[in-house]
Interface confidence: low
Amino acid sequence: NWVNVISDLKKIEDLIQSMHIDATLYTESDVHPSCKVTAMKCFLLELQVISLESGDASIHDTVENLIILANNSLSSNGNVTESGCKECEELEEKNIKEFLQSFVHIVQMFINTS
Amino acid sequence: ITCPPPMSVEHADIWVKSYSLYSRERYICNSGFKRKAGTSSLTECVLNKATNVAHWTTPSLKCIRDPALVHQRPAPPSTVTTAGVTPQPESLSPSGKE
């Protein structure tokens, strides 16, 4: 599933090339392994901002598909509880390009540990 | 055709650079507040073709207390479990796209 998440992220990267979305999004660029689920949830939440601001149906659907895939993968790991992690709103806001790059990195972290 | 002043959003301000049709502007959360993750600060001046009246789209923005400031008070650590993230329900006919 995480591999499919990466391919959806690549699709989103391609789709937004032609759009002017100047949003800045909460981005965890240095994910601590003990906070990776919390960080992933922030990425998934902020991905919805891209969906909202793009106004493009294909982006809406790719985002929704990605969220379903990621949730399935997270739940298959069982209920992991993480404490003392940063809330999304405490993270630094970065542009969409940097956000998506960091998103790919955290997904790769999940791939490497699954 | 131009848009009227945009609606107010709690704990946020907006400085409109242009009221022209298709202008895109952003609200900014007030000091001590942060944009809630997953919400958008964007508003766009669009035309309702049925009435020929321009209006600003409704932003999904929610401004919440800055957790960094809240955490300055003693509080239990935040805990997260792997319950799913649900996509925000999207209107089937968004008000901003008439």
């Epitope: 149906a57 294909s58 | 006919s93 796209k97």
Partner: antibody
């Protein structure tokens, strides 16, 4: 108010092509995708394809070799072309607006097409 | 492709009766949409993403389900509910529809 209206021939000769235009109002084709669906007594509702806001298309594999969907955003028109029609292509052809999540939230009235010599 | 099987194909219900229409998918899908169609008209979106009522749909309608099993329920049948109902999956291409359930009023 969102509206879609299909226009095209009601009768097509076997082996000929079918061209239908879907004219829309109340929304922008640069933002919203448009699906094509047909309905016949024998096969029920069949999804044929979709053209996205950005211009890319997805087709039902069963029709891909003979189907083309294009559009003119400035004229608010979507063009459907299917080649090599046979009698079993006789159906009502609909265009439908795509909301989020592949929701066909508004449909045209449909145009009835008979394939016969 | 994902095949959607609706049951029953035809049914009739008395006013006030509870009605349930089911849609079974040949493989698991994320969500199901439902359309209502009356004779001579185009399909109308009725329920989207499994359980959300489209604009103007009476609250006596509800949708539920997951995986391969979905259903549309009318808590109390009314004459205006007589129509054909179709399910549609949006999880994989090609998008597919069920063959329909024709609901008649007794």
């Amino acid at each position: 108010e969102v509206k879609l209206k299909e226009s095209g021939p009601s009768l097509v000769q076997p082996s000929q092509s079918l061209s239908i235009t879907c004219t829309v109002s109340g929304f922008s084709l640069t933002t919203y995708a448009v699906h094509w669906v047909r309905q016949s007594p024998g096969k029920g509702l069949e999804w044929l394809g979709v053209i996205w806001g950005a211009g890319s298309t997805d087709y039902n594999a069963a029709f891909m070799s003979r189907l083309s969907i294009t559009k003119d955003n400035s004229k608010s028109q979507v063009f459907f072309k299917m080649n090599s029609l046979q009698a079993d292509d006789t159906a009502i052809y609909f265009c439908a607006k795509n909301g989020a999540y592949y929701v066909m939230d508004y449909w045209g009235q449909g145009t009835s097409v008979t394939v016969s010599s | 492709e994902i095949v959607l099987t609706q049951s029953p194909a035809i049914m009739s219900a008395s006013p006030g009766e509870k009605v349930t229409i089911t849609c079974s998918a040949s493989s698991s899908v994320s969500y199901m949409h439902w359309f209502q169609q009356r004779p001579g008209t185009s399909p109308k979106l009725w329920i989207y993403s499994t359980s959300n009522l489209a604009s103007g749909v009476p609250a006596r309608f509800s949708g539920s389900g997951s995986g391969t099993s979905y259903s549309l329920t009318i808590s109390r049948m009314e004459a205006e509910d007589a129509a054909t109902y179709y399910c549609q999956q949006r999880s994989s291409y090609p998008l597919t529809f069920g063959a329909g359930t024709k609901l008649e009023i007794k």
